[in-house]
Amino acid sequence: KFSKQSWGLENEALIVRCPRQGKPSYTVDWYYSQTNKSIPTQERNRVFASGQLLKFLPAAVADSGIYTCIVRSPTFNRTGYANVTIYKKQSDCNVPDYLMYSTVSGSEKNSKIYCPTIDLYNWTAPLEWFKNCQALQGSRYRAHKSFLVIDNVMTEDAGDYTCKFIHNENGANYSVTATRSFTVKDEQGFSLFPVIGAPAQNEIKEVEIGKNANLTCSACFGKGTQFLAAVLWQLNGTKITDFGEPRIQQEEGQNQSFSNGLACLDMVLRIADVKEEDLLLQYDCLALNLHGLRRHTVRLSRKNPIDHHS
């Protein structure tokens, strides 16, 4: 339950907050879960703990893994888990789904796009904003504090927006980028019984033991902005948050995309360090809205190594 997905790019700063909260005066100990090795608090280290925050300055792909934080309140030791994934920088412009933060919707009256996670960093204005990798220019775009305001929003303003800022730590500067999709509300919409595009019903997904696996639940719900539409994953009929396996997490926030004018939602299920017991679980992709609920079931199977028989 007290587990949080965090992700970043190599050579950028990444700061992660312990999912268990406490007063600033409380001691927080951080450990690398796989080895139970304590994370140092000395700032001279590239990866160090600072109270409730775990800082990667800068992050490296090898930092990926599950980190344990223990908040020592006067009464209890509260444990949380930060599931950190550091990705290699993409050479092309496309920002993959797994690097996207939750989608925001805007309309003519309200078109604020907040820069995700920025509150964790020591940054100074102004932010730089990009849309589909192009720097935003023109009087319609205004970078204000930690958000972007777009004047006279049009349908064409939908897309992926990236904020870029500099985190300063003891005089050293580190770059941070974060991307989220922006959709424009369409008043002339309609809603349908959910249609799950992926996975196929009773799909068998091959995975490798010890590797990471991603399952994407993707469904469409109609045209335009949808109310009360959601996609989610269940394990053996239980919500991911209640299942209690920190290695298995849903992507934070749902990515909204418009396919042929349809409003669709994705939810990525990330399984870290696939284990044998994961093959025994039933993975259900659920899509629901006011019309009802549709469920597609997936099971995992072990990917067989390629035979080298003559």
Epitope: K1, F2, Q21, K23, P24, S25, P74, T75, F76
Partner: antibody, heavy 121, light 106 residues
Framework: QVQLVQSGAEVKKPGASVKVSCKAS????????MYWVRQAPGQGLEWMGA????????AFNQKFKGRVTMTADKSTSTAYMELSSLRSEDTAVYYC??????????????WGQGTMVTVSS | DIQMTQSPSSLSASVGDRVTITCSAS?????MHWYQQKPGKAPKRLIY???KLASGVPSRFSGSGSGTDYTFTISSLQPEDAATYYC?????????FGQGTKLEIK
């Protein structure tokens, strides 16, 4: 809104046990620890112990250790405090209070209405 | 255990008066919380983290202090402020309260 509703008044004989319930609503039960405080007639407030409903972990005031049991039922969002080997000095109002201490601190902002326990032969 | 000594144990003041209650801890604490309790009612949190005003509490109530010495103040006493006031520390186990200060209106 956050509400803590406690069970009704109890009259017990010395040596018996009493179990007081505290039903929570208006927030995610497992997100906050539940604390128990008692107040003898005309006296001050005395902390008895606490439970983390998420994990079932408990912490007690040494004074009550061995006599008090705290449990939490996640399915009904209810916390329980059981005090055994009752004596006359356990006559008091027993309160549950929610404790969630973070930057937007609302620890001990919400209290149950209290349960009067009378121990008398 | 950290002992909390509140003073005075009782006091009587007039409407409009400035009232101060002190709480001394037997060893240093990070924060002090203050509660108001009226007969037959559960305690009501007024001040938390030494000086932060709880939601919906009038601004005439305030708190200050650090280390072992803390102060609770009512800047202008109102008739509805007649009650017993408690300080409480939550810096170490067990959580402890002061013995209370009974405030009467003259």
């Amino acid at each position: 809104q956050v509400q803590l509703v406690q069970s009704g008044a109890e009259v017990k004989k010395p040596g018996a046990s009493v179990k007081v319930s505290c039903k929570a609503s208006g927030y995610t039960f497992t997100d906050s620890e539940m604390y128990w405080v008692r107040q003898a007639p005309g006296q001050g407030l005395e902390w008895m112990g606490a439970i983390d409903p998420e994990t079932g972990d408990t912490a007690f005031n040494q004074k009550f250790k061995g006599r008090v049991t705290m449990t939490a039922d996640k399915s009904t969002s209810t916390a329980y405090m059981e005090l055994s080997s009752l004596r006359s000095e356990d006559t008091a109002v027993y309160y549950c209070t929610r404790a969630f201490d973070n930057d937007n601190d609302d620890a001990f902002a919400y209290w149950g209405q209290g349960t009067m326990v009378t121990v008398s032969s | 255990d950290i002992q909390m000594t509140q003073s005075p144990s009782s006091l009587s003041a007039s409407v409009g008066d400035r009232v101060t209650i002190t709480c001394s801890a037997s060893s240093s604490v990070n924060y002090m919380h203050w509660y108001q309790q009226k007969p037959g009612k559960a305690p009501k949190r007024l001040i938390y983290d030494t000086s932060k005003l709880a939601s919906g509490v009038p601004s005439r109530f305030s708190g200050s202090g650090s280390g072992t010495d803390y102060t609770f103040t009512i800047s202008s006493l109102q008739p509805e402020d007649a009650a017993t006031y408690y300080c409480q520390q939550w810096s170490s186990n067990p959580l402890t309260f002061g013995q209370g200060t009974k405030l009467e209106i003259k």
